[in-house]
């Protein structure tokens, strides 16, 4: 089960008091507390193509956009991994490659996107509103998914638009240490703002949910990708998810890796060929899930709360544990 | 609930091998990769190997290549792990453990079968 | 290889202390650590897998914290059934190794 929680949302003043003159000078403020928020939140891309030549066969295209190491990659379906999801693939830098049917063949790109080739015929089959996610883990930062599928009119051969789509789910050392910078310096912002205007600044208004496990909403880095954030997870067409993952192919690690910087700070891009600007796929969502950085498919710890910066790495799952062939 | 049962003491003759047996209970068997790890008297714990119980692929520590062979039965949900050509070396607790998800940790652990050189 | 130094080899505490175990690997292992604990009977439980994150049915006082090649087990305070062999184990890399244990004893 994944704990949700609402974390401090940053609420507006309340209008009448100022009048829209007071609104108006608050722009800025707010304006330098959205950057805050979202200053250097890694994405995660998710792309999903049907193939004009097989139109049970599905191509999903992941990438990591951030500077961290990776350590581990899950591709799910049927919504994220651990809510639900049914793991088809887990890519490890060092140690390789499990995946599961009908999963044909999961291999690294670059040393932050993967992807994955699924095809089918009969209950394990994708069907066209299946719901792919990719979660990357990336240590100490934290866990990032994010998913798509294709839009419901999507002509055979043609790809949904990339998905970025950030979760933020990081140790909470790493987070309040990073965010507590940034957070600091905001509400000193607010503060000397205040002072200057004589003005009462936006307040943070605590969370009345569990101390458990924390979520910090924070503001979208784009219209679009906020407006996907409000989109519901509502049903997944049950025909479409597999019968069984006991079957496997095997399949090595990447070969290259060994020879690729590992700690290399790099902002790699998503494949300009497949779309120039990653916008959410229709039907896109985020998801969330509390506790500090776990691997793909583990459950979240049981204590301590970590925090996360959009509303949505082992939580129940269609089986009990992912086990596929390298 | 979960239990990893392992088979009783050897006593083996230098030179003979052994066949050592882990029960799986309390889950799906294929579902989960199983490992198995050597602990000499008073030292730390060495990785052997480890089995995809789905279909048999094995994975070994290059030092244990030529001395263990990994095998499953799913119909009994069992990992075997034999020793072969044994010596006073190979006198050790040995362990049968299951990943908890892929990659992971190593969340349930049997209770160990002891090997004794019994020259 | 990946080389995994645990510290101190033993260590001597009383009830109720707060104690530290420490793990270095010889490379950066990306989190890819587990904590595990070794009673004089043998059993073996995990007790905080990834670095950092507790195992179900682990008592709160136990937690783990650490990057890049520096890890710490912590045990906030002693409790008699605390005293035991604790081990690291790193899983980024083939063959997996563990440290070679800390031996934790009552003072």
């Known amino acids: 089960m994944r704990t949700e929680a609402q974390v401090p949302a940053l609420q507006p003043p309340e209008p009448g008091l100022e009048g829209a003159m007071g609104h108006r000078t608050l722009v800025l403020p707010w304006v330098l507390l959205t950057l805050c928020v979202t200053a250097g939140t890694p994405e995660v891309w998710v792309q999903v193509r049907m193939e004009a030549t097989e139109l049970s066969s599905f191509t999903i295209r992941c990438g990591f956009l951030g500077s961290g190491s990776i350590s581990l990659v899950t591709v799910s379906w049927g919504g994220p991994n651990g809510a639900g999801g049914t793991t088809l693939a887990v890519l490890h830098p060092e140690r390789g490659i499990r995946q599961w049917a009908p999963a044909r063949q999961a291999r690294w790109e670059t040393q932050s996107s993967i992807s994955l080739i699924l095809e089918g015929s009969g209950a394990s089959s994708p069907c066209a509103n299946t719901t792919f996610c990719c979660k990357f883990a990336s240590f100490p930062e934290g866990s990032w998914e994010a998913c798509g599928s294709l839009p419901p009119s999507s002509d055979p051969g043609l790809s949904a638009p990339p998905t970025p789509a950030p979760i933020l789910r990081a140790d909470l050392a790493g987070i309040l240490g990073v965010s507590g910078v940034l957070l600091f310096g905001c509400v000193y912002l607010l503060h000397l703002l205040r002072r200057h205007k004589h003005r009462p600044a936006p307040r943070l208004q605590p969370s009345r949910t569990s101390p458990q496990a924390p979520r910090a909403r924070a503001w979208a880095p784009s219209q679009a990708s906020q407006a996907a954030l409000h989109v519901p997870y509502a049903t997944i067409n049950t025909s479409c998810r597999p019968a069984t993952l006991d079957t496997a192919h095997p399949h090595g690690g990447p070969s290259w890796w060994a020879s690729l910087p590992t700690h290399a700070a790099h902002r790699p891009q998503g494949p300009a060929a497949w779309a120039s600007t990653p916008i959410p796929a229709r039907g896109s969502f985020v998801s969330v899930e509390n506790g500090l950085y776990a691997q793909a498919g583990e459950r979240p710890p049981h204590t301590g709360p970590g925090l996360t910066l959009f509303p949505d790495p082992r939580g129940p799952r269609a089986m009990e544990g992912p086990l596929g062939v390298r | 609930q979960v239990q990893l049962q392992q088979s009783g003491a050897e006593l083996v003759k230098p030179g003979a091998s052994v066949k050592l047996s882990c029960k799986a209970s309390g889950y799906t068997f294929t579902s989960h990769y199983m490992y198995w790890l050597k602990q000499r008297p008073g030292q730390g714990l060495e990785w052997i190997g480890e089995i995809n119980p789905s279909n048999g692929d094995t994975k070994f520590n290059e030092k244990f290549k030529s001395k263990a062979t990994l095998t499953v039965d799913k119909s009994s949900s069992t990992a075997y792990m034999q020793l072969s050509s044994l010596t006073s070396e190979d006198s050790a607790v040995y362990y049968c453990t299951r990943e908890k998800d892929a990659f992971s940790a190593l969340d349930y652990w049997g209770q160990g079968t002891s090997v004794t050189d019994s020259s | 290889d990946i080389q995994m130094i645990q510290s101190p080899s033993s260590m001597f505490a009383s009830l109720g202390d707060r104690v530290s175990l420490s793990c270095r690997a010889s490379q950066g292992i990306r989190g890819h650590l587990d904590w595990y604990q070794q009673k004089p009977g043998g059993t073996i439980k995990l007790l905080i897998y990834s670095t950092s994150i507790l195992n179900f049915g682990v008592p709160s006082r136990f937690s783990g914290s650490g990057s890049g090649s520096d890890y710490s087990l912590t045990i906030s305070s002693l409790e008699s059934e605390d005293f035991a062999d604790y081990y690291c184990?790193?899983?980024?890399?083939?063959?997996?190794?563990f440290g070679a244990g800390t031996k934790l004893e009552l003072k």
């Open positions: 184990l790193q899983r980024n890399a083939y063959p997996l190794t």
